[in-house]
């Protein structure tokens, strides 16, 4: 058993049929010595008396809010949550496996630049009685500070018969050094509580590996005289790190016909302009990637050829 | 060439070669889902590689003030990785074909380090740890870790030379 926060405790249980469970001793936070009784949740049934209460925790029916009273007055509470371990593996019932980039990916994170700011998100099908708390650091043995905000519900989607809820959190490294080569990964820890079930999820990454620039901005076409060619120009996204002579991007320019089956023409360039042939009913798209490190491409910025 | 103690490197040449290094490092070990290398026993493997750290003067301001600190750090790293890529970590099994990008990577690391340091002058170099794993799986794991680490190192070096070529070239 360990303390998650004041008056909230997590009991770690090996979860299998007829498991013996864990013996837990609760102590009433009071100077009083006698006349103390214990109840669980809203029930008025007295579970025991005395300053301490010993219970055998085996299942969710044994978890909940234990309250000690004296003469009708509440003295203190202890909330017991359960953390299940099945076949040596902690349960992951609350969050959905996003399966990208690999199986057992529950948390996904992205950064728009090298400033040390990043966003993580996760998915669940649970809509109520759900709380999250997020902590982060750089490195684990001698951790350096990363400050995370509160997790918020950022999107709701309907997937078949189910509703899916996306939560996200923003974090910022306290003393970020954008130009340095990271040697210690960022660690992100999410505590998830659904009713009386506790689970924790972790992710470990370097900012460089989760970089995904915003799409290029101000995408414009300039027809070239007496030609089917156009000059496409664009700018670095505002959110990208500066100076651009140091934090450079490379670009992919694509000409795509109306039909998905039509052959796509692609050009790669380090410049912020390119000359391409604009076909009727086609569109021109440009996306960006860090020039020197193969992290994710941005989403496409597009304009119609006409 | 970067004569230590003062004169500028051939920024544009260094920029071109460092960008080629980035491409080669990713060809040698593309991002594929075969292993999360940080989970696969991080013990004594690549902890000793030289990293370009915050105080090494490789940021735009540091380069403007005095690029020599940063160039020395980059040179140190290039020599270190060049020795690693020439070691039995990369020559043993699993066998690399002669067309492997590792061979070109090895040569290009040497080329860039020579651009930064002419013959006759020696910056101190970091000792290369004696890593000679006997099993193919240990060797392959080390290879992957070294190449992932090299990708990060050459990315910073390439930024330095790109910025230098754009703003510090005579």
């Amino acid at each position: 058993i360990w303390e998650l926060k004041k008056d909230v405790y997590v009991v770690e249980l090996d979860w299998y049929p007829d498991a013996p469970g864990e013996m837990v001793v609760l102590t009433c936070d009071t100077p009083e010595e006698d006349g103390i009784t214990w109840t669980l949740d809203q029930s008025s049934e007295v579970l025991g008396s005395g300053k301490t209460l010993t219970i055998q925790v085996k299942e969710f029916g044994d978890a909940g809010q234990y309250t000690c009273h004296k003469g009708g007055e509440v003295l203190s509470h202890s909330l017991l949550l359960l953390h299940k371990k099945e076949d040596g593996i902690w349960s992951t019932d609350i969050l959905k496996d996003q399966k990208e980039p690999k199986n057992k990916t529950f948390l996904r994170c992205e950064a728009k630049n090298y400033s040390g700011r990043f966003t993580c998100w996760w998915l669940t099908t649970i809509s109520t009685d759900l709380t999250f708390s997020v902590k982060s650091s750089r490195g684990s043995s001698d951790p350096q500070g990363v400050t995370c905000g509160a997790a918020t519900l950022s999107a709701e989607r309907v997937r078949g018969d189910n509703k899916e809820y996306e939560y996200s959190v923003e974090c910022q490294e306290d003393s970020a050094c954008p130009a340095a080569e990271e040697s210690l990964p960022i660690e992100v820890m999410v505590d998830a509580v659904h009713k009386l079930k506790y689970e924790n999820y972790t992710s470990s990454f370097f900012i460089r590996d989760i970089i995904k620039p915003d799409p290029p901005k101000n995408l414009q076409l300039k027809p070239l005289k007496n030609s089917r060619q156009v000059e496409v120009s664009w700018e670095y996204p505002d959110t990208w790190s500066t100076p651009h002579s140091y934090f450079s991007l490379t670009f992919c320019v694509q000409v795509q016909g109306k039909s998905k089956r039509e052959k796509k023409d692609r050009v790669f360039t380090d410049k912020t302009s390119a000359t391409v042939i604009c076909r009727k009913n086609a569109s021109i798209s440009v996306r960006a990637q860090d020039r020197y490190y193969s992290s994710s491409w941005s989403e496409w910025a597009s304009v119609p050829c006409s | 060439r970067a004569v230590p103690g003062g004169s500028s490197p051939a920024w544009t040449q260094c920029q071109q070669l460092s960008q080629k290094l980035c491409t080669l490092a990713w060809s040698a070990h593309p991002l594929v889902g075969h292993m999360d290398l940080r989970e696969e026993g991080d013990e004594e493997t690549t902890n000793d590689v030289p990293h370009i750290q915050c105080g090494d003067g490789c940021d735009p301001q540091g380069l403007r003030d005095n690029s020599q600190f940063c160039l020395q750090r980059i040179h140190q790293g290039l020599i270190f990785y060049e020795k690693l890529l020439g070691s039995d970590i990369f020559t043993g099994e699993p066998s690399l074909l002669p067309d492997s990008p590792v061979g070109q990577l090895h040569a290009s690391l040497l080329g860039l380090s020579q651009l930064l340091q002419p013959e006759g002058h020696h910056w101190e170099t970091q000792q290369i740890p004696s890593l000679s794993p006997s099993q193919p799986w240990q060797r392959l794991l080390l290879r992957f870790k070294i190449l992932r680490s090299l990708q990060a190192f050459v990315a910073v070096a390439a930024r330095v030379f790109a910025h230098g070529a754009a703003t510090l070239s005579p």
């Epitope: - | 060809s27 040698a28 070990h29 593309p30 594929v32 889902g33 075969h34 292993m35 099994e93 699993p94 066998s95 690399l96 074909l97 002669p98 067309d99 492997s100 990008p101 590792v102 061979g103 099993q135 193919p136 799986w137 060797r139 392959l140 794991l141």
Partner: antibody, heavy 120, light 107 residues
Framework: QVQLVQSGAEVKKPGSSVKVSCKAS????????IHWMRQAPGQGLEWIGY????????KYNENFKGKVTITADKSTSTAYMELSSLRSEDTAVYYC?????????????WGQGTLVTVSS | DIQMTQSPSSLSASVGDRVTITCKAS??????VAWYQQKPGKVPKLLIY???TRHTGVPSRFSGSGSRTDFTLTISSLQPEDVADYFC?????????FGSGTKLEIK
């Protein structure tokens, strides 16, 4: 796109020789090794060896040394595999293939195969 | 030479079945193992490399696992178009060697 086109089927007498060609296109010929494999009827694959056209250096499976000569002609982007002293057990489909760009020998592109039949 | 012992040599399964083919290397090959599919009269087609990395365009029902000496190719839900021979291949050590193949048929 990368293509490897092999020469047509051959029927040979025991003791004679055969030279199979593999014309490459869609990539820099000198930049990658070209490998040869064979597959006897109803059998698995056997790796014979490779040539690296950049420096014309071949490497052979010891089991085929003296039996096989692998060469390359840079001017026509063609690799050749010559089998000498043919015996009936050399009857097989012979494939040329090129590996992944990362320098490890898993084979992405294959020629269509050339059936060599050795029969008196 | 490294021997790649592949089993079974043939197997028959129903559409939708989970199918497993194994390969045992005679010594440590790390994860330097590829799997190929060869349909009758066709050339081998790469499915998996580095023991578990799916090649571009290969359906997700194909997966590979294993390291050092023991390797597995799994088809999670057999489809009619999966009828073929399957070969494992070690590229750790010269001479590169292949398993003897598994002929997969539909019941």
């Amino acid at each position: 796109q990368v293509q490897l086109v092999q020469s047509g089927a051959e029927v040979k007498k025991p003791g004679s020789s055969v030279k199979v060609s593999c014309k490459a296109s869609g990539y820099t010929f000198t930049g990658q090794t070209i490998h040869w494999m064979r597959q006897a009827p109803g059998q698995g694959l056997e790796w014979i060896g490779y040539i690296y056209p950049r420096d014309d250096s071949p490497k052979y499976n010891e089991n085929f040394k003296g039996k096989v000569t692998i060469t390359a002609d840079k001017s026509t982007s063609t690799a050749y595999m010559e089998l000498s002293s043919l015996r009936s057990e050399d009857t097989a489909v012979y494939y040329c293939a090129i590996p992944d760009r990362s320098g490890y020998a898993w084979f992405i592109y294959w020629g269509q195969g050339t059936l060599v039949t050795v029969s008196s | 030479d490294i021997q790649m012992t592949q089993s079974p040599s043939s197997l028959s399964a129903s559409v939708g079945d989970r199918v497993t083919i194994t390969c045992k290397a005679s010594r440590d090959v790390a994860i330097a193992v590829a799997w190929y599919q060869q349909k009758p009269g066709k050339v081998p087609k790469l499915l998996i490399y580095w023991a578990s990395t799916r090649h571009t365009g290969v359906p997700s029902r194909f997966s590979g696992s294993g390291s050092r000496t023991d390797f597995t190719l799994t088809i999670s839900s057999l489809q009619p178009e999966d009828v073929a021979d399957y070969f494992c291949h070690q590229y750790s050590s010269y001479p590169f060697t292949f398993g003897s193949g598994t002929k997969l048929e539909i019941k």
